[in-house]
Amino acid sequence: EEELQVIQPDKSVSVAAGESAILHCTVTSLIPVGPIQWFRGAGPARELIYNQKEGHFPRVTTVSESTKRENMDFSISISNITPADAGTYYCVKFRKGSPDTEFKSGAGTELSVRAKPSAPVVSGPAARATPQHTVSFTCESHGFSPRDITLKWFKNGNELSDFQTNVDPVGESVSYSIHSTAKVVLTREDVHSQVICEVAHVTLQGDPLRGTANLSETIRVPPTLEVTQQPVRAENQVNVTCQVRKFYPQRLQLTWLENGNVSRTETASTVTENKDGTYNWMSWLLVNVSAHRDDVKLTCQVEHDGQPAVSKSHDLKVSA
């Protein structure tokens, strides 16, 4: 007579997170009397997953009717699989007794969990930087399994090459995280630029996940100033304009000084936008020439985005 065998036909099973995993197990005999138990792992620290005899296992259902008189199929379905469920599952026949004693174990089925990476989160530097500077962007994605993953960086559709990527942990784990840092050189034209981190994984079926960062949140383009004197509008008045060009972001305050004394301060409001996303703004000052006996030094002083002020001066000749 052949002794009971516990058959686990699948050496391995791979399941997507959130789905149910079916672990197959059949026995060849109803002898001896006693329950089937399922464990994750082996040895004294093994974790009980299901006991035919007793206990409450809310995530586990038997595939066939375990109470059916001649049932020899003890396959189970585990619902709502997460990466934490990965491991080797053993179907074990016990012999009735006080206590029940282990009679025979199946060879085990390794359950691997395919878990999607989280949406990549791209973050840039804490402070803005100006063109020609190199800034670092980081990209993070978590909770994926298996470990194999591909990460790429793009700037406006052009693949970047200057980046470093780490996948943690290095050893076996239920799930993994990826962290990548890319270096990007800013140009004056980058207000509308985007940096994209793209993550490809087996669970995504060829449709990679993307995280983006807008360089508009990172770049500061300082303005160029030009002060010009307009033709005289009235006999005693001169119109002086200060052209503030190609700046970003919009936050800007302009102060007019006459011979070093503050004449007027204003904040940029009705700006015009250039194609590249930078702004232009113009401020003008009417100078009453008759009020001055000597030449007047007019200064346009601009404080942009909280940076130290830049200025441009113009000497206004006062004829006797």
Epitope: E2, S29, L30, I31, P32, K53
Partner: antibody
Amino acid sequence: RQLVESGGGLVQPGGSLRLSCAASGFSLSSHGISWVRQAPGKGLEYIGTIGTGVITYYASWAKGRFTGSKTSSTAYLQMTSLRAEDTAVYYCARGSAWNDPFDYWGQGTLVTVSS
Amino acid sequence: DIEMTQSPSSVSASVGDRVTLTCQASQSVYGNNDLAWYQQKPGQAPKLLIYLASTLATGVPSRFSGSGSGTDFTLTISSLQPEDFATYYCLGGGDDEADNVFGGGTKVEIK
């Protein structure tokens, strides 16, 4: 699917008897066979179960005098040192109890122990 | 060893009656559900009705039902039929493989 017992009859006190239980329609290889007896006008009494070689067990009162064995088609119950109180109808049944209950029964064979 | 006590030892009932038989174990049965019910008519072998305390055996009419757990179990016949007049036995299993014991039986007679 059925079980048919044979081997019952009259036996003297102290004597021995071997009962047979032939299965048809299924194999005994993956099933236990249990033996149950019923004294005249009394209730049912469990004797023991024959599984495989190492898996054979008996009620405490039956140990020593009753021995079971089986092939893929026939189960046997060897009874020794028989006493008058062993007089009963002996049934064989397929099953080992708990989730393997006694679902097919033989028709029973009468064993009478008397001088 | 486990001991099984059935009550009453006999009950008189009429066709159509609801009949409840009880079986009490001296200790919790194995797995709290190692309890089967058998029907026996004179001159015949027993017939399996219920196993694992509440699972109806194949081919058994649905008027038979079993319930209970641990030490106290019942067999209910919801509407007694003429063919149900018989003796009913419970079989309880203790923690040991060989510890299988029948109750004394309850005879269901015609009133």
